[in-house]
């Protein structure tokens, strides 16, 4: 109960929650969330822990077909959707039970993607031409990474890869690249 | 940092064979599929054929099924391109590029990531 | 094969100009990109999906089309944006690109 999920037209997953999650964060940048100075140990609150691990957060599942222009996949995908607030694993699924999400008092752990996964796919058209195969990275498992507060609303960005951060407003894009321009880590990107 | 790392420039002869090597680097070259594009000197671009270096399978553009292959060695994220018997007409600028993928309520794909390019000269 | 056309061949502009390059699909496709190549290096994506600004790229660029006729626009030529600009589709196989358009200094 509480985790029912429908699916509508555009293939999107709407959890049926006594209220609704957080929209997902933007995807983990492990340059910025590994530096050093990013760390430091939180303001104490009641269910402060010592390890990040002992966190845990929602994995939603997500099906969709995947397309290219009036090409479809012959087959939907499923991937995870890494949802809402992280809170103490031992008390996160009461809450989850009870369609409330924990929210701490001291840092802001979030659920962002931690593992992908590669999947090759094949379009089939309309009017039977035969389009190319695909291939597609996939949300394979989610992780909560802990914001401190000397994470600064630019650096909340760098959650984001270069490669799906938004700019100026507009939509997530992918980073122009070459060789000789090697410029921000996409390796996140899905 | 997330790149491509081709060897380096090959001065060959006629009738040789040859086979250079594209490494990715910060990624997994299986996630994705890699190519090889062509351009001879003063010319376009030409794609030449693509790897899932997962699983080894390759397509060919028609003009270069047969003339050259393109195989994959993913334990080291690296892609090659060979040539069993070099011809003049061969000496060309030859690029590796990274196929990138995002989904945000659409699927898009790009070529995001090219190598530096390893330039091949066939002269006798 | 899905041949890509682009005119016109060369295009003589000064600085702060607005640039129209085109690209012509044999036939229809559903999405194409652009990249621009400057001497001795390696192309870079400068639009995917038609008319979407790839990262790091300047507004003065701008993609748009359907079917199997397809325009980037830079706006303003800068000094910088003097180069080769190729087209491509990446949804049949062959994948194939466009001869390209250099956009020379007047």
């Known amino acids: 109960q509480g985790w029912q999920a429908f699916k509508n037209d555009a293939t999107e997953i709407i959890p049926e929650l006594g209220e609704y999650p957080e929209p997902p964060p933007e995807l983990e940048n492990n340059k910025t969330m590994n530096r050093a100075e990013n760390g430091g140990r939180p303001p104490h609150h009641p269910f402060e822990t010592k390890d990040v691990s002992e966190y845990s957060c929602r994995e939603l599942h997500f099906t969709r077909y995947v397309t290219d222009g009036p090409c479809r996949s012959a087959k939907p995908v499923t991937e995870l959707v890494c949802s809402g607030q992280c809170g103490p694993a031992r008390l996160l699924p009461n809450a989850i039970g009870r369609g409330k999400w924990w929210r701490p008092s001291g840092p802001d752990f979030r659920c962002i993607p931690d593992r992908y996964r590669a999947q090759r796919v094949q379009l089939l058209c309309p009017g039977g031409e035969a389009p190319r195969a695909r291939k597609v990275r996939l949300v394979a498992s989610c992780k909560c990474k802990r914001l401190t507060r000397f994470h600064n609303q630019s650096e909340l960005k760098d959650f984001g890869t270069e490669a799906a951060r938004p700019q100026k407003g507009r939509k997530p894009r992918p980073r122009a690249r070459s060789a000789k321009a090697n410029q921000a880590e996409l390796e996140n990107a899905y | 940092e997330v790149q491509l790392v081709q060897s380096g420039a090959e001065v060959k002869k006629p009738g040789e064979s040859l086979k250079i090597s594209c490494k990715g680097s910060?990624?997994?070259?299986?996630?994705?599929?890699i190519h090889w594009v062509r351009q001879m000197p003063g010319k376009g671009l030409e794609w030449m054929g693509q790897?899932?270096?997962?699983?080894?399978?390759?397509e060919y553009a028609p003009r270069f099924q047969g003339q050259v292959t393109i195989s994959a060695d993913k334990s080291i994220s690296t892609a090659y391109l060979q040539w069993s018997s070099l011809k003049a007409s061969d000496t060309a600028m030859y690029y590796c590029?990274?196929?990138?993928?995002?989904?945000?309520?659409?699927?898009?794909?790009?070529?995001?990531?090219w190598g530096q390019g390893t330039t091949v000269t066939v002269s006798s | 094969e899905i041949v890509l056309t682009q005119s016109p061949a060369t295009l003589s502009l000064s600085p702060g100009e607005r640039a129209t390059l085109s690209c012509s699909a044999s036939?229809?496709?559903?999405?194409i990109h652009w990249y621009q190549q400057k001497p001795g290096q390696a192309p870079r994506l400068l639009i995917y999906?038609?008319?979407e600004l790839a990262s790091g790229i300047p507004a003065r660029f701008s993609g748009s089309g359907s079917g199997t006729d397809f325009t980037l626009t830079i706006s303003s030529l800068e000094p910088e944006d003097f180069a080769v600009y190729y087209c491509q589709q990446l949804s049949h196989l062959p994948l194939t690109f466009g001869g390209g358009t250099k956009v020379e200094i007047k």
């Open positions: 910060d990624f997994e070259i299986k996630d994705y599929y």
């Open positions: 036939s229809s496709v559903s999405y």
């Open positions: 590029a990274r196929e990138g993928y995002y989904y945000d309520g659409r699927d898009y794909w790009y070529f995001d990531v």
């Open positions: 790897i899932d270096a997962e699983d080894g399978e390759t």
């Open positions: 999906s038609t008319s």
